[in-house]
């Protein structure tokens, strides 16, 4: 038994036929010693007398609000809730399994940007006697603050004969660092109480993995002379992180009729305009995705082909515009070849995802995982890799990136990747290894050697352990190179002389 909140207690029960249940001792919160009686819920039947009451809790009939009285006066209440464990598994009766992205997904969370603000939602078919409370933190062993609001009913849907209720909650990390590479996941815990049943649900994620941008805004069409094509332009959504030269998006532009089975024109671009073939009764749609990290695509923003939008065929806000930043040399050190670094780091992002695309859909946060990921270097908040830090002095950040590149290059050349099951030198991992080396050499200033971090002694003995470790390292590398790519894209747009 444990206290959920003041005067509310959860009794954990192994739930099977003829289970002995749990013995619970309730104590009346009063200085009185004599003449105390106990009742359950609205019943006037006296269950016992004395300052304490011992009960055997086996089923829901034994749960409820226990009240101690003296004379006609109520002294205190204790509400007992039951948390069922069947075959070693805690019950999940209150919430509906959303089955996306995998089975046993009860909580789903999304973030519109990297500000540390996110929304979680869940589904239930229960309409009454239902309460939720939400807690969140970053990391679990030394948790950092995340503040969540109250869960509210956000939607009602009819599914066949049943009504389905969607609840949602908004949370905000107290000290968010949008430009940093997350090393500890956000933990979300939802307590659900239906009548006398208690259940808890948890979710663990990095903000980068739940990013889903809002759709692009302000779609405009401009017909092109002597062509069947139109130029479509758009702008970054207002809710996306800024500056866009650092937090860049990539876009998919599609022309399609009302039916998904109809023919279409489709093109991908990093710019905020594209030329496509429009036709009568079709629509042009544009959606966005983080350019350097393969999280979710936004919903589509659409405009009909007929009546070509407004006449302003402007090119939008420019995906890599650097705001009003003047070009300037990097103080405190030689300037890197920003554009070359940008191209190579973007290639690294592509390679990191093609090295094992499934890595993005595997849940690798298991026991012992924090040891693995804490062994690798992360680009942290104080490393100067945010836009302001880069403008002040990019050397700190570049040194950190260089250390990370060398570290991962050594890791990809180690027994973890060279041992069984073997990988060929020109596999995506082989190409990744070579590109890490290439970028680190571009960064290393002449006659200047930055200190490098020691490679950890991770030597798995079994091939399956090696495989799991590879996945974890690649997953971590995907996050690292995404931050590096943002740094170089921003540098190329705003710092390059």
């Amino acid at each position: 038994i444990w206290e959920l909140k003041k005067d509310v207690y959860v009794v954990e029960l192994d739930w099977y036929p003829d289970a002995p249940g749990e013995m619970v001792v309730l104590t009346c919160d009063t200085p009185e010693e004599d003449g105390i009686t106990w009742t359950l819920d609205q019943s006037s039947e006296v269950l016992g007398s004395g300052k304490t009451l011992t009960i055997q809790v086996k089923e829901f009939g034994d749960a409820g609000q226990y009240t101690c009285h003296k004379g006609g006066e109520v002294l205190s209440h204790s509400l007992l809730l039951l948390h069922k464990k069947e075959d070693g598994i805690w019950s999940t009766d209150i919430l509906k399994d959303q089955k996306e992205p995998k089975n046993k997904t009860f909580l789903r969370c999304e973030a519109k940007n990297y500000s540390g603000r996110f929304t979680c939602w869940w589904l239930t078919t229960i309409s009454t006697d239902l309460t939720f409370s939400v807690k969140s933190s970053r990391g679990s062993s030394d948790p950092q603050g995340v503040t969540c609001g109250a869960a509210t009913l956000s939607a009602e849907r009819v599914r066949g004969d049943n009504k389905e209720y969607e609840y949602s909650v908004e949370c905000q990390e107290d000290s968010a660092c949008p430009a940093a590479e997350e090393s500890l996941p956000i933990e979300v815990m939802v307590d659900a109480v239906h009548k006398l049943k208690y259940e808890n649900y948890t979710s663990s994620f990095f903000i980068r993995d739940i990013i889903k941008p809002d759709p692009p805004k302000n779609l405009q069409l401009k017909p092109l002379k002597n062509s069947r094509q139109v130029e479509v332009s758009w702008e970054y959504p207002d809710t996306w992180s800024t500056p866009h030269s650092y937090f860049s998006l990539t876009f998919c532009v599609q022309v399609q009729g009302k039916s998904k089975r109809e023919k279409k024109d489709r093109v991908f671009t990093d710019k905020t305009s594209a030329t496509v073939a429009c036709r009568k009764n079709a629509s042009i749609s544009v959606r966005a995705q983080d350019r350097y990290y393969s999280s979710s695509w936004s919903e589509w923003a659409s405009v009909p082909c007929s009546g070509s939008g407004s006449s302003r065929g402007g090119s939008g806000s420019g995906g890599s515009g650097g705001g009003g930043s003047k070009l300037r040399a990097v103080p405190g050190g030689s300037s890197p070849a920003w554009t070359q670094c940008q191209q190579l780091s973007q290639k690294l992002c592509t390679l990191a995802w093609s090295a094992h695309p499934l890595v993005g859909h595997m849940d690798l946060r298991e026991e012992g995982d924090e040891e693995t990921t804490n062994d690798v270097p992360h680009i942290q908040c104080g490393d100067g890799c945010d836009p302001q830090g880069l403008r002040d002095n990019s050397q700190f950040c570049l040194q950190r990136i260089h250390q990370g590149l060398i570290f991962y290059e050594k890791l990809l050349g180690s027994d973890i990747f060279t041992g069984e099951p073997s990988l060929l030198p020109d596999s995506p991992v082989g190409q990744l290894h070579a590109s890490l080396l290439g970028l680190s050499q571009l960064l290393q200033p002449e006659g200047h050697h930055w200190e490098t971090q020691q490679i950890p002694s991770l030597s798995p003995s079994q091939p399956w352990q090696r495989l799991l470790l590879r996945f974890k390292i690649l997953r971590s590398l995907q996050a690292f190179v995404a931050v590096a790519a943002r740094v170089f894209a921003h540098g190329a747009a705003t710092l390059s002389p």
Epitope: Q229, R261, V267, T269, T275
Partner: antibody, heavy 118, light 107 residues
Framework: QVQLVQSGAEVKKPGASVKVSCKAS????????LHWVRQAPGQGLEWMGW????????EYAPKFQGRVTMTTDTSTSTAYMELRSLRSDDTAVYYC???????????WGQGTMVTVSS | EIVMTQSPATLSVSPGERATLSCRAS??????LHWYQQKPGQAPRLLIY???QSISGIPARFSGSGSGTEFTLTISSLQSEDFAVYYC?????????FGGGTKVEIK
Amino acid sequence: QVQLVQSGAEVKKPGASVKVSCKASGYTFTDYYLHWVRQAPGQGLEWMGWIDPENGDTEYAPKFQGRVTMTTDTSTSTAYMELRSLRSDDTAVYYCNANKELRYFDVWGQGTMVTVSS
Amino acid sequence: EIVMTQSPATLSVSPGERATLSCRASQSISINLHWYQQKPGQAPRLLIYFASQSISGIPARFSGSGSGTEFTLTISSLQSEDFAVYYCQQSNSFPLTFGGGTKVEIK
């Protein structure tokens, strides 16, 4: 299944025109874009243009603009590509191809060899 | 127009070995890149679309990667039926253009 059958080989004199046909079957003709791509002997592939059989919209590669005409006959599910003012370097295999996506080529015809020789 | 350059022009590989073919665009084309296989006397066949998307019916040994200006087609273990000419094609902008091709021949 989706199939494209092209007309037979042609031999033409320089300055003449050629009209190659491409008969589609196994799908609703107006549901796919149709492209023409050519390949000179021992050479690579060269895109010529596309037509939307639903409305007759066309887009030609600048190299062929003014010299090529692509048309369709929806009643017979046939596409045509006419190339005028033939030169010897127009000697090639001409392929028609169809796809629901405009910008790449899924289903190909067997090709029609056009020889331009005096 | 966008110029596509493939390398090497000819690649000699033994059956069972891995083949890596490269394609470079003269400007950034995001992932608007497709790969085809052509055998002598036959029409080309689509292998990969949008840089890395696989086609049903195409063996899993064919995979594509890349974005921007550099792309790779990998054949993990060459079978006898894979000896052919491979072309890349960009769809970023019209006119659509192809690379010059890479001939994969038996070593």
